[in-house]
């Protein structure tokens, strides 16, 4: 039978520059002598020879003279390989072949790792910062392996995922330098932290920067937005109103105006250096350039989608700074419900029927109410399901199970809670036997 060769199941993790032991063992029979042993270590994939022991002798390293066996332990069945000064290029699978009279082999994985340095943080621009300025924060960490995972968060633990660009470059030794860039609009002050994780070592390196922008002594710009959410129908254009009071002699060259998504800090639209910098939001936004000088910083959002719903912040910086957030509530009216009956013919009083009320392409989720011909609510045996399509619009299907009386009217009301729009359909079932829909 075959010789049993044992290696660790889990990869051997080795730090770059250190020595690693790839364990391999076999069970020698009584009377075993090293003269009988053939031991070969090779790279599993390329079959390149790494080290061997044959004819009673260590044949030495065939792998950059960085490998060694444990000669004093071979006779006890220890065929482990020592790999010195581990490099990134060593990562992979090594196979240990043992042959005495019988033969056996097993492969062991080497996972190379190198810890990342404590990140350094740089800020651009890094002086004369004011609230409302857009800054680029770069987090750099060096000489790690394998590629890092990078996470950003603010000073209260809120993850920052919008406007992050991370690049990782390998040097000649295969070690990675990671550079992660976060673009943010400064508030009154803020802490931004970057965490660089080595996924193999589960080693975290983190740094943070706290930015306290200068405030001018004259106080903040008062920025005004509507308190109530702006309600916009899907597919239409919406105006997110924002205004400020320009001082006498104000010129647009002094104005920094930034619209961004409140939570993710994603840039939406900006006006800086005396000109409209355009839309950073799917080219669906516009300012009112002729009105800016009068303090109208409103934003036009075209062809509103469900995904646009949320809070938008209007930052205005002249010499001073101010900001305010306005909520966009997206809505879409529900279609007039269609009613179907199952079964829909040869109906008799006492039959149980299923009435389905379907209404389409509304937002947000609908409220559905059933009632009979006398206005009595029907709440038992109602099942309502709402499914969003790719655009986020809901199709609502509400199913009522009833036992027919001599005749009856059943009506379904589908309400859009934001628009307070009601769409209703009803079905009247009369006579016996009856069919649905009634024949002309």
């Amino acid at each position: 039978g075959a010789l049993e060769v044992q290696v660790p199941e889990d990869p051997v993790v080795a730090l770059v520059g250190t020595d690693a032991t790839l364990c391999c063992s076999f069970s020698p029979e009584p009377g075993f002598s090293l003269a009988q042993l053939n031991l070969i270590w090779q790279l599993t994939d390329t079959k390149q020879l790494v080290h061997s022991f044959a004819e009673g002798q260590d044949q030495g390293s065939a792998y950059a003279n960085r490998t060694a066996l444990f000669p004093d332990l071979l006779a006890q069945g220890n065929a482990s390989l020592r790999l010195q000064r581990v490099r990134v290029a060593d990562e992979g699978s090594f196979t240990c072949f043992v042959s005495i009279r019988d033969f056996g082999s097993a492969a062991v994985s080497l996972q190379v790792a190198a810890p990342y340095s404590k990140p350094s943080m740089t800020l651009e621009p890094n002086k004369d910062l004011r609230p409302g300025d857009t800054v680029t924060i770069t987090c750099s960490s060096y000489q790690g392996y394998p590629e890092a995972e990078v996470f950003w968060q603010d000073g209260q633990g809120v993850p920052l995922t919008g406007n992050v660009t991370t690049s990782q470059m390998a040097n000649e030794q295969g070690l990675f330098d990671v550079h992660s860039i976060l673009r943010v609009v400064l508030g009154a002050n803020g802490t931004y932290s970057c965490l660089v994780r080595n996924p193999v070592l589960q080693q975290d390196a983190h740094s943070s920067v706290t930015i306290t922008p200068q405030r001018s002594p004259t106080g903040a710009v008062e920025v005004q937005v509507p308190e109530d959410p702006v309600v916009a129908l899907v597919g239409t254009d919406a105006t997110l109103r924002c205004s400020f009071s320009p001082e006498p002699g104000f010129s647009l060259a002094q104005l920094n105006l930034i619209w961004q998504l409140t939570d993710t800090k994603q840039l939406v639209h900006s006006f800086t250096e005396g000109r409209d910098q355009g839309s950073a939001y799917a080219n669906r936004t516009a300012l009112f350039p002729d009105l800016l000088a009068q303090g109208n910083a409103s934003l036009r959002l075209q062809r509103v989608r469900v995904a646009d719903e949320g809070s938008f912040t209007c930052f205005v910086s002249i010499r001073d700074f101010g900001s305010a957030a306005v909520s966009l509530q997206v809505a879409a009216p529900y279609s007039k419900p269609s009613m179907t009956l199952e079964p829909n013919k040869d109906l008799r009083p006492g039959d149980t029927v299923t009435i389905t009320c379907s209404s389409y392409r509304g937002y947000p989720e609908a409220e559905v109410f059933w009632q009979d011909g006398q206005g009595v609510p029907l709440t038992g045996n109602v099942t309502t399901s709402q499914m969003a399509n790719e655009q986020g619009l809901f199709d609502v299907h509400s199913v009522l199970r009833v036992v027919l009386g001599a005749n009856g009217t059943y009506s379904c009301l589908v309400r859009n809670p934001v628009l307070q729009q009601d769409a209703h359909g009803s079905v009247t079932i009369t006579g016996q036997p009856m069919t649905f829909p009634p024949e002309a």
Partner: antibody, heavy 121, light 106 residues
Framework: EVQLVQSGAEVKKPGSSVKVSCKAS????????IHWVRQAPGQGLEWMGY????????DYAQKFQGRVTLTADKSTSTAYMELSSLRSEDTAVYYC??????????????WGQGTTVTVSS | DIQLTQSPSFLSASVGDRVTITCRAS?????MNWYQQKPGKSPKPWIY???NLASGVPSRFSVSVSGTEHTLTISSLQPEDFATYYC?????????FGQGTKLEIK
Amino acid sequence: EVQLVQSGAEVKKPGSSVKVSCKASGYSFTSYTIHWVRQAPGQGLEWMGYINPNSRNTDYAQKFQGRVTLTADKSTSTAYMELSSLRSEDTAVYYCARYSGSTPYWYFDVWGQGTTVTVSS
Amino acid sequence: DIQLTQSPSFLSASVGDRVTITCRASSSVSYMNWYQQKPGKSPKPWIYATSNLASGVPSRFSVSVSGTEHTLTISSLQPEDFATYYCQQWSSNPLTFGQGTKLEIK
């Protein structure tokens, strides 16, 4: 002692709204975000959203967008959660919780005692 | 969204047993937190920042990580450990919890 004390149980009709309060004490209210988490009977924990009491920034789970409104009153150190268009599936215990810690590691270190909201016709 | 899947959902064990609860994330998370909840009570912080025990949590609790799999181990179950445990992440929006693992007395 750091504490979050929530308002009492509520029974509501379908289609109506409920507003739950969460009063903070023993720490600087504006220094930490307040989150709302609900738990339906026999079910797990479900995150609804958070508010930063200082900036009043909010973020909501997609499921609750358009139905939930989180507000905070700095003068009374109180956070509020209002849920509209109630349906029977909204019957649950609603918790407020403080997200605390130090950069870059944060967790819910203090929870309110929970407010039971029952939606029934 | 990052999904957190806990396994098992239910676990019956005896006092003195060694038990493990796994929380698998659908993608990498910056850190994982764990909470303990007993019936009729609010959740309590149990383990934060992947492997740090919250105040008052006994040292028989530990967490190990392999890739996106976080494993909570109780080395020797005590009567007060029977509860439901939830994992939680907020590396990216939305914040998510695992569905919970209920640890019951066998």
